[in-house]
Amino acid sequence: AGGPGSRARAAGARGCRLRSQLVPVRALGLGHRSDELVRFRFCSGSCRRARSPHDLSLASLLGAGALRPPPGSRPVSQPCCRPTRYEAVSFMDVNSTWRTVDRLSATACGCLG
Amino acid sequence: AGGPGSRARAAGARGCRLRSQLVPVRALGLGHRSDELVRFRFCSGSCRRARSPHDLSLASLLGAGALRPPPGSRPVSQPCCRPTRYEAVSFMDVNSTWRTVDRLSATACGCLG
């Protein structure tokens, strides 16, 4: 049960992937007044498997405290789990006007950078 | 001193850019025994200016506590400041052997994803 195969699968389950949640339109920060819910898809998870030699050394330097990054902007030592495709999201506002916002929700993810 | 120009410059200083530091080879995690220092260049800084509509809504949802990301993998609400080009780094190990590690140091950065 604890062999390499099972460990790799467990790590993969935490990897970069598309996730989905119903969210209130008003929390999207679009400035539209609406009490509706919409489905918002986003990307999250690890991209450790896609690390370059630079990333491995950067992680080692950060871990050893040998690098002094500027305050508030710690460098990223793996590619980022980010959307590679998007879709529009539609909803009804409080005036019963149908609104569509382009490229609001992710439809695919990748380890970018 | 507090006009728009200075604000823009200050923001620029926090933006994604190439940074450089002398670091001990032994802290690079390469497995090479060496007491040398090398120049390691890396990328850090904000990519807020490159945010998409998706990113703005994702940031709003996270700020409002309306999104439940999985534990330990908070989604990234802006492109990542990451290397776009790399260079080799060379150094002498304790046996006076010249070592070269490809693609170890960054030479250019960009807001990716």
């Epitope: 989905s20 119903l22 209130p24 509706e36 539609s90 009804m92 019963s96 149908w98 | -």
Partner: antibody, heavy 122, light 107 residues
Framework: EVQLVESGGDLVQPGGSLKLSCAAS????????MHWVRQASGKGLEWVGR??????????EYGASVKGRFTISRDDSKNTAYLQMNSLKIEDTAVYYC?????????????WGQGTMVTVSS | DIQMTQSPSSLSASVGDRVTITCRAS??????LNWYQQKPGKAPNLLIY???TLESGVPSRFSGSGSGTDFTLTISSLQPEDFEIYYC?????????FGQGTKVEIK
């Protein structure tokens, strides 16, 4: 808290009628489609029908087994949907769920009510 | 109507096992396929949206894949709370249809 609450389930004789209600709270559903799904005891899930939103002129569609007998309606001002069931048959006995389907390129049964029991028996 | 066929209809497994449930559509449905978990006496709960998107709050051990007519739901390491009934459902065409369900039981 976002929730749907069904009511109106009862014991009714074959050939009788019953009207189920589904009230939404914690959000408004005027932009969403409202569906009804049922489940007979120990059986799988069966789609009953749906009513679309105002943009789609409140269009309704029904499953073959209930078409012509059941009618779905909605009152967006009350955030409530209804299922009018006429000419009930013994095989209509089931737990009835109302479900919200939010707009999307691909749709899913997003928010489910707790279900209300309809028993058709003589 | 589009027929959805799930297999197996039931399976016995142990905690920690990797489990795969398949769902086949009678015609191509692209990725208009959702997976639900149902606990006794409760309404179903959406697990996987659009064939492979993990619904928020659902543990990462669940994953979905497939497109067209063949789809799978995988649980990478079964936990005690996963011994329930699972349904696939297509939203490609009206009437929306479900698979007959797969009951995951303790071995």
């Amino acid at each position: 808290e976002v929730q749907l609450v069904e009511s109106g389930g009862d014991l009714v004789q074959p050939g009788g009628s019953l009207k189920l209600s589904c009230a939404a709270s914690g959000f408004t559903f005027s932009g969403s489609a409202m569906h009804w799904v049922r489940q007979a005891s120990g059986k799988g899930l069966e789609w009953v029908g749906r009513i679309r939103n105002k943009v789609h002129r409140y269009a309704t569609e029904y499953g073959a087994s209930v078409k012509g007998r059941f009618t779905i309606s909605r009152d967006d001002s009350k955030n409530t949907a209804y299922l009018q069931m006429n000419s009930l048959k013994i095989e209509d006995t089931a737990v009835y769920y109302c479900v919200v389907v939010v707009p999307g390129s691909i749709e899913a049964f997003d928010i489910w009510g707790q279900g209300t029991m309809v028993t058709v028996s003589s | 109507d589009i027929q959805m066929t799930q297999s197996p209809s039931s399976l016995s497994a142990s905690v920690g096992d990797r489990v795969t449930i398949t769902c086949r559509a009678s015609q191509s449905i692209s990725t208009y396929l959702n997976w639900y978990q149902q606990k006794p006496g409760k309404a179903p709960n959406l697990l996987i949206y659009a064939a492979s998107t993990l619904e928020s709050g659902v543990p990462s051990r669940f994953s979905g894949s497939g497109s067209g007519t063949d789809f799978t739901l995988t649980i990478s390491s079964l936990q005690p709370e996963d011994f329930e009934i699972y349904y696939c459902q297509q939203s490609y065409n009206i009437p929306w249809t479900f698979g007959q369900g797969t009951k995951v039981e303790i071995k």
